[in-house]
């Protein structure tokens, strides 16, 4: 506990001290006192620097001295053989004797009691700024006027700070302008104008004049400007060592001037004014600014465009244009938005054809579709090539955006037909020589394939079964082989308006107009063994001279079979109608008069006993294309005959392209068209 | 040359097992259905068993019917009948006998064109 | 189950002879059976298939006819190879059954 007065005597005052003693006092007397200490008595053995025997005395780390020996008063009026003065409050005092004494030595008494100190004067740091006044047991300090009083209790500055302004144009200036600024203050002065506005200070170099920097190029007073996250300073000296004009960028700013307690200068003055948040003219490239000027500041809309072939992409959704404003941050909007190349997507895939995947999709891009040769082609034309349009479509220059469309080639077989001998006289074929060949097993018969949708047969064929099983791509009929073929399912059947349809079918004698056609459920995929016939022209090319040679084939009777297991086909001439009216019906269910021969049936055979027979019925008598000798068309349908081996009738196909056309048309989904 | 050559027949006690092989070679035998017949000393032929060309279908006698049990493996060109619980009244020439089956949905069945020399099955204690 | 009644069950005939064999089945088998020829420690052969069709290799002096119930195998002219016994057999559906046989003999 400090105390403001203390007595301190060596062990067994007035007495001998004794050996091998250390003691020491801890002197403590109340803050803002310094400490006298003086000593009365003093008899300690004497040895060269104290080294024996002493007193010590020590301020904070300082030997403020150490004493042996003897001491009288220099004063007849005063006690005091040794003194000292302290300016802190406390203070340690050290007696040590060592091991022997050669005579006795009675010690010390020492008293101490509390000063008051001069803070104004006695120590080497001034306390205050300004003006410092000494009170017992402490000091404190003022200001001159228009000073005040730093929180720190020692420090004097102007009140220069607070300031805030507004509005759009001002001056502001240093304390005291164009007289000396106050030494030792902190002045901030705050610009707060509307958003999209920038600060934009100017002053001239004469109206600066601040103190100069140090050695280390450190200013000593200094202005400096913050905006935002920029910083513009700090500067000194005598001229303004910045630019003239600084624009801020920001619609804040924020003016320190910081000066030291030395060197006044007389200050500083600016001026400052508001401009519109200017936005860049940036470079968005494949675009186009509207209007174009030459600076946008704040609030100024332009719509930027984007060149034919290039697109904003926001989202999912593509646009041509944007529009962009110049935004209170000097930023535009949308600024994000840029012209990409326009993407055409990945090409849509179309049937039966394909497209290579593109090295890119974006605008200009080309791409090509081909059909799967050789089962298809390109019917709508064009060349198949697209190219990426501007308007993010794949165009080509025939068809514009409207996709190819792959349709099987008809009447084209794999491999040529060669004769070896079986259908009546016929011989064993593959598939691939009759790739349009269809297998209707309920009741046993053939049909042809003339497109992915449809098949031609006769009517007789489907009149009692209106949803037939139909298989594809098979030369062998046996069960295990049509199971691992194309079957294929009946959407409707349509028999010719023509055929007479009986209660009793067995007993028919009139196969005129005996033609039908089957709409399939799924489209026909063509290939080697799969692939329709073609339908004959309507010009008079196509009508069959007495003569002209046809390919048939089937499963039908042979003269070995009542069904043949692998496929049939023979070469017939076409005969005049007369030499099937000649021959004799086999079992017939009716006198032979009453069976009917129009001109809508062809006759054919009485060569070698080829002819088509039982199980036959539906299937093509295909007849080379005049007008393309690759091609087959379907001329006839196995019809009926009077014997098997002889002569057989066959529907004329010509007589019926209108009606199977416009079955075809009128029955059409979406999905083939 | 199309052929079927049986194998497996025996003398067996009755309740015994006996399991009969039929090898077939000349022609693609998964093509075809298969059945067996059999003919007792001094009897008539009675139809034992058939078969589908890919063993999805098959038919017994009621004489047999839980008791044999017809497979083939058409990697093996081969045709099996499978015989538990026999009796004395199975005892008989087992043939084999291929079958032909025309059309898709709506079958043609050809029955046993052609035949095996068989294979003697005995059953006795 | 179908069943196949086979009459006669043996007949003598003499080389030249015509021979007819018939077959009725318990119900309408269409003409959905077969015919067959056995020789004494032979397997059979198939003669007609589809009731009426000859198998090809067969002589044309055999001949099938018939569909529904009634079913006849006619040999317009007995060879001396034709001595043997012949079955029917209905095919129309599980279980197949073969008719008990005719026993054709030299008179």
């Known amino acids: 506990e400090p105390t403001m007065y203390g007595e301190i005597l060596s062990p067994n005052y007035p007495q001998a001290y004794p050996s091998e003693v250390e003691k020491s006092w801890d002197i403590e007397v109340p803050e803002g006192y310094g400490i006298h200490l003086y000593f009365t008595h003093l008899d300690i053995e004497l040895s060269e620097n104290c080294a024996y025997d002493s007193v010590q005395i020590i301020s904070g780390d300082t030997e403020e001295g150490r004493l042996c020996g003897q001491r009288s008063s220099n004063n007849p009026h005063s006690p005091i053989v040794e003194e000292f003065q302290v300016p802190y409050n406390k203070l340690q005092v050290i007696f040590k004797s060592d091991f022997s004494n050669e005579e006795r030595f009675t010690g010390f008494a020492a008293y101490y009691v509390a000063t008051d100190i001069n803070e104004c004067t006695d120590f080497v740091d001034v306390p205050c700024s300004h003006f410092c006044n000494n009170f017992i047991g402490g000091y404190f300090c003022s200001c001159p006027p228009e000073y005040f009083l730093h929180d720190d209790m020692k420090n004097c500055g102007v009140n220069c700070s607070g300031d805030v302004f507004t509005a759009l144009i001002g001056e502001i200036a240093s304390p005291n302008y164009p007289k000396p600024y106050p030494e030792n203050s902190r002045c901030e002065y705050q610009i707060r104008l509307e958003k999209g506005f920038q600060v934009v200070v100017t002053l001239r170099r004469e109206d600066f004049d601040v103190e100069a920097a140090d050695s280390a190029g450190n200013c000593l007073d200094s202005l400096v400007f913050v905006a935002g996250d920029r910083q513009f300073g700090p500067y000194c000296g005598h001229g303004f060592p910045g630019p003239l004009n600084i624009e801020t960028k920001s619609n804040a700013l924020d003016i320190i001037f910081q000066t030291d307690l030395t060197g006044q200068k007389k200050g500083w003055k600016l001026r400052y004014h508001g401009d519109p948040m200017p936005c860049p003219k940036e470079d968005t490239p494949n675009s186009v600014w509207e209007p174009a000027k030459a600076k946008y500041v704040f609030r100024d809309v332009v719509q930027i465009t984007c060149l034919d072939g290039f697109e904003v992409v926001e989202g999912r959704v593509g646009a041509t244009s944007f529009y962009s404003t110049c935004q209170s941050n000097g930023k535009w909007s949308n600024s994000k938005l840029k012209c990409q190349p326009v993407d055409c997507g990945i090409p849509e895939s179309i049937e039966n054809g394909k497209v290579e995947d593109p090295e890119s999709t974006l605008f200009g891009s080309v791409i090509r579709y081909t059909c799967e040769e050789p089962y298809y082609y390109m019917e709508n034309g064009g060349g198949g090539e697209y190219h990426c349009a501007g308007n993010g479509s794949w165009v080509n220059e025939v068809l514009g955006p409207e996709l190819p469309k792959c349709v099987p080639v008809c009447g084209v077989p794999r491999e040529p037909f060669e004769e070896k001998q079986r259908i009546i006289g016929g011989s064993d074929a593959d598939i691939k020589n009759f790739p349009w060949q269809v297998f209707f097993d309920n009741p046993w018969a053939g049909g042809a394939l003339i497109n992915e949708y449809w098949v031609l047969t006769a009517a007789h064929v489907v009149e009692g079964n209106r949803e037939p099983t139909m298989y594809v791509g098979s030369t062998s009929v046996q069960t295990s082989r049509l199971a691992k073929s194309k079957m294929l399912t009946p959407e409707h059947v349509f028999i010719h308006p023509g055929w007479k349809l009986l209660e009793v079918p067995e007993g028919r004698t009139n196969f005129d107009n005996d033609i039908a056609l089957v709409r399939l459920k799924d489209p026909v995929k063509m290939g080697p063994t799969v692939s329709p016939i073609c339908l004959p022209g309507t010009s008079s090319d196509y009508n069959l001279m007495d003569g002209d040679l046809g390919l048939i084939s089937g499963w039908g009777r042979t003269e070995k079979r009542d069904r043949a297991v692998r496929l049939k086909a023979a070469r017939l001439p076409v005969a005049p109608l007369r030499k099937c009216k000649e021959v004799k019906v086999e079992k017939p269910t009716a006198d032979a008069e009453a069976y009917v021969f129009t001109p809508n049936m062809i006759c054919a055979g009485g060569e070698k006993g080829m002819d088509s027979c039982k199980g036959d019925s539906g299937g093509a008598f295909a007849v080379q294309d005049p007008n393309d000798k690759t091609k087959f068309y379907a001329a006839g349908l196995v019809s009926w005959g009077p014997q098997c081996g002889t002569y057989g009738l066959y529907t004329r196909v010509k007589n019926y392209v209108d009606w199977i056309m416009k079955t075809m048309q009128e029955n059409s989904t979406p999905r083939e068209d | 040359e199309v052929q079927l050559v049986e194998s497996g027949g025996g003398v067996v006690r009755p309740g015994g097992s006996l399991r009969l092989s039929c090898a077939a070679s000349g022609f693609t035998f998964d093509d075809y259905g298969m059945s067996w017949v059999r003919q007792a000393p001094g009897k008539g032929l009675e139809w034992v068993s058939g078969?589908?060309?890919?063993?999805?279908?098959?038919g017994y006698a009621d004489s047999v019917k839980g008791r044999f049990s017809i497979s083939r493996d058409n990697a093996k060109n081969s045709l099996y009948l499978q015989m538990n619980s026999l009796r004395a009244e199975d005892t008989a020439l087992y043939y084999c006998a291929r079958d032909e089956q025309l059309g898709g949905l709506k079958y043609y069945y050809y029955y046993m064109d052609v035949w095996g020399k068989g294979t003697t099955v005995t059953v006795s204690s | 189950d179908i069943q196949m009644t086979q009459s006669p069950s043996s007949l003598s005939a003499s080389v030249g002879d015509r021979v007819t064999i018939t077959c009725r089945a318990s119900?309408?088998?269409?003409?959905?059976l077969g015919w067959y020829q056995q020789k004494p420690g032979k397997a059979p052969k198939r003669l007609i298939y589809t009731a009426s069709n000859l198998q090809s290799g067969v002589p044309s002096r055999f001949s099938g006819s018939g569909s529904g119930t009634e079913f006849t195998l006619t040999i317009s002219s007995l060879q001396p190879e034709d001595f043997a016994t012949y079955y029917c057999l209905q095919y129309h559906s599980y279980p197949l059954r073969f008719g008990g046989g005719t026993k054709v003999e030299i008179k």
């Open positions: 078969i589908n060309w890919e063993g999805g279908s098959t």
């Open positions: 119900q309408g088998i269409r003409n959905d």
